[in-house]
């Protein structure tokens, strides 16, 4: 008779990231007997839901179940049936839903209600759907990348698990860019965090962390573009907007009603003598950069120093992982290499934005034109946000690491969120046998 392998004693968890532009489902797996060890949880699957973000279903809430079904069915196939009932499912919605809630709490609640009803139909242990705060989004992103980099482990390693990992236990800062918001989170060096709203205290694995975090709502790449268009159309002499952030020869008609649909453009709203206008690209990086800078109010700062819009930002400290759209955009532009200096990035952006639209379309035939057309803006926006918004310099640019995955797990807030909600980050350093802990993040 053959020796039968003992069943793996593993656990699974599912987190859905309901972002402004799309929803992704992540499946995590870990050995049951090592729950409190650092670095044991890893991602086994990402399923990107085909379609827009959940906030777009506000007029079609009854269809949210249809929208989620493929990825949820995928989860039922990936996770062994015997584990279904004990697998927790969490859905966290971010800035797209924060914006919808600003417009109508009732509509946001209706969307979440249908999401909850839909997810409750599956054989998992559904734990709820909620809009997470910007502070949570920043904090959980910071926990994720430092957990995956092994920064919370007390065992110093003589080897590096990822190319940009330093062997010291200094944590990485986290830079997250979404479609509707952006987060900056890091441990400042012996600096008091002057605004209580931006201060977090954690005790993780026996060590205290004083963390700075801020989420800038409306400063994700998609909402920043809407802001820029709303700002620029104010001073347009007619219904033609010559825009340096789009390639020469690019043309697109925009409905004014779409422009003013988002709360992010309210501050620029005015009565225009036309219902539509045409963007005509002129592809000039420097002018695009200048136009973007006008979105950052740097004239007012009630603290020792600020990022923009009067928000406190301590001096930058240490290395930073830049993920989500920071990574996707820079990856598309082929600018994620550690060897590319800030000056070189700027140089390459100048060349890219100046390329004629017809040429760009031919070079990237497989990419949807809407997304393709926005890379010039997005790349320029990333540079503007990091340099002028967050005060990175040509020197400190080298401390930014554009990262998609660490050890096979996506960088982002979802892993940190699950680790916290499943009580897998102990406040104290676990002994060799796992103990139960009552104090968690």
């Amino acid at each position: 008779t053959q020796n039968k392998a003992l069943p793996e004693n593993v656990k699974y968890g599912i987190v859905l990231d309901a972002g402004s532009s799309h929803t992704s489902l992540y499946i995590y797996k870990w050995p049951a007997e090592k729950e409190n060890d650092t670095g044991v949880v890893h991602q086994v699957e990402e399923c990107r839901v085909k379609g827009p973000g959940i906030s777009k279903f506000v007029q079609k809430v009854n269809e949210i179940g249809i929208y989620l079904t493929d990825c949820m069915a995928r989860a039922t196939a990936v996770i062994p049936r015997s584990q279904h009932q004990e697998t927790p499912v969490y859905l966290g919605a971010t800035a797209g839903m924060r914006l919808l809630r600003m417009e109508s709490e009732e509509l946001a609640d209706r969307v979440l209600d249908v999401v909850e009803r839909s997810l409750s139909n599956y054989p998992f242990d559904f734990q709820g759907a909620r809009i997470i705060t910007g502070q949570e989004e920043g904090a959980y992103g910071w926990i994720t990348i430092n957990y995956l980099l092994g920064k919370f482990s007390q065992k110093t390693r003589w080897f590096s698990i990822v190319p940009y990992e330093t062997n010291n236990q200094e944590t990485f800062g986290a830079l997250d860019l979404g479609g509707a918001s952006t987060q900056v989170t890091f441990v400042p060096q012996n600096q008091t965090i002057e605004s209580p709203d931006n201060a977090l205290q954690f005790r993780l694995y026996g060590k205290d962390y004083n963390v700075y975090t801020h989420s800038f709502l409306c400063y994700g790449k998609d909402q920043a573009l809407w802001q820029k268009l709303a700002k620029d159309i104010q001073v347009a002499s007619n219904e033609i907007l010559r825009d340096p952030c789009f390639h020469p020869g690019y043309k697109k008609v925009v409905n004014v009603s779409d422009l003013y649909k988002t709360p992010c453009t309210k501050r620029f709203e005015m009565t225009l003598p036309f219902q539509q206008f045409e963007i005509q690209g002129i592809g000039n990086y420097q002018q695009c950069h200048q136009s973007i800078l006008e979105l950052f109010n740097t004239s007012y700062c009630p603290y020792s120093q600020c990022a923009f819009n009067g928000i406190f930002l301590p001096p930058l400290q240490g290395d930073f992982g830049a993920f989500s759209a920071f990574y996707f955009v820079m990856k598309f532009l082929n600018l994620t290499s550690e060897k590319v200096s800030q000056e070189k990035v700027t140089e390459m952006m100048k060349k890219f934005c100046a390329q004629p639209w017809e040429e760009i379309k031919t070079s990237y035939a497989g990419v949807k034109e809407k997304y393709l057309s926005e890379y010039c803006f997005s790349g320029t926006y990333i540079l503007s946000l990091l340099l002028q918004g967050y005060h990175f310099t040509a020197d400190s640019w080298e401390h930014i690491h554009f990262i998609g995955k660490i050890q096979g797990s996506d960088a982002g807030w979802t892993l940190g969120y699950m680790l916290n909600l499943t009580n897998m980050i102990p406040a104290e350093q676990p002994l060799s046998t796992p103990l139960s802990h009552s104090t968690y993040v």
């Epitope: 990107r48 085909k50 827009p52 777009k56 279903f57 249809i66 839909s118 599956y122 949807k368 034109e369």
Partner: antibody, heavy 122, light 111 residues
């Protein structure tokens, strides 16, 4: 505008193999699923299977397993259907199609290729 | 496999009148609170076109005269008022379970 452009008609001998292509334009192939559907002259529709080009995951009708292999190439935004050990029963029009939500708005729409006519004959 | 039986096999309806096509599944196509039943239209020499998804939702750009209903095993497609351009083959399709299957089709003609 979303378009699926299929390769031209094929005349092949029994026992041979063929690879049909479906070039997608107007959207990123990774943002959708691609289905393959078979239709014999004056007959109904048969679902062969579906591929998720984002990760290569496939679902097949078991009766086409071993006969059909679906693949995709995200760099060229193209889906492929490879048919092997061809017999006269494989003579049909083969469609590639996508149906589902648009990636910007909550609009559910479908797009089909024009169909590739495969004739298996000696 | 889930077998879909369409009825009638052919149907002639006067312009402006209601056309009703039925589809019965050999087992329920409901799952997770959703009815995984779709309807397609096909005209000669053309690929099929999605009309209805998840039993009752209209595809993008589909005229309001097309509606779908039903749950479990019994579904129907209604066209009201019937127009000349609606003469075509109609297929029901289930996507609850692999293999996804189509009904045998209903030929709709103008009376």
């Amino acid at each position: 505008e979303v378009q699926l452009q299929q390769s031209g008609a094929e005349l092949v001998k029994p026992g041979a193999s063929v690879k049909l292509s479906c070039i997608v334009s107007g959207f990123n192939i990774k943002d959708t699923y691609i289905n393959w559907v078979k239709q014999r002259p004056e007959q109904g529709l048969e679902w062969i299977g579906r591929i998720d080009p984002a990760n290569g995951n496939t679902k097949y009708d078991p009766k086409f397993q071993g006969k059909a292999t679906m693949t995709s190439d995200t760099s060229s935004n193209t889906a492929y259907l490879h048919l092997s050990s061809l017999t006269s029963d494989d003579s049909a029009v083969y469609y590639c199609a996508r149906w589902g939500y648009d990636d910007e708005e909550a609009d559910y729409f479908d797009s089909w290729g024009q169909g590739t006519t495969l004739t298996v004959s000696s | 496999d889930i077998v879909l039986t369409q009825s009638p096999a052919s149907l002639a309806v006067s312009l402006g009148q209601r056309a009703t096509i039925s589809c019965r599944a050999s087992e329920s196509v409901d799952n997770y609170g959703i009815s995984f039943m779709n309807w397609f239209q096909q005209k000669p020499g053309q690929p099929p076109k999605l009309l209805i998804y998840a039993a009752s939702n209209q595809g993008s750009g589909v005229p309001a005269r097309f509606s779908g209903s039903g749950s479990g095993t019994d579904f129907s497609l209604n066209i009201l008022p019937m127009e000349e351009v609606d003469a075509a083959m109609y297929f029901c399709h289930q996507s609850k379970e692999v293999p996804w299957t189509f009904g045998g089709g209903t030929k709709l003609e103008i009376k």
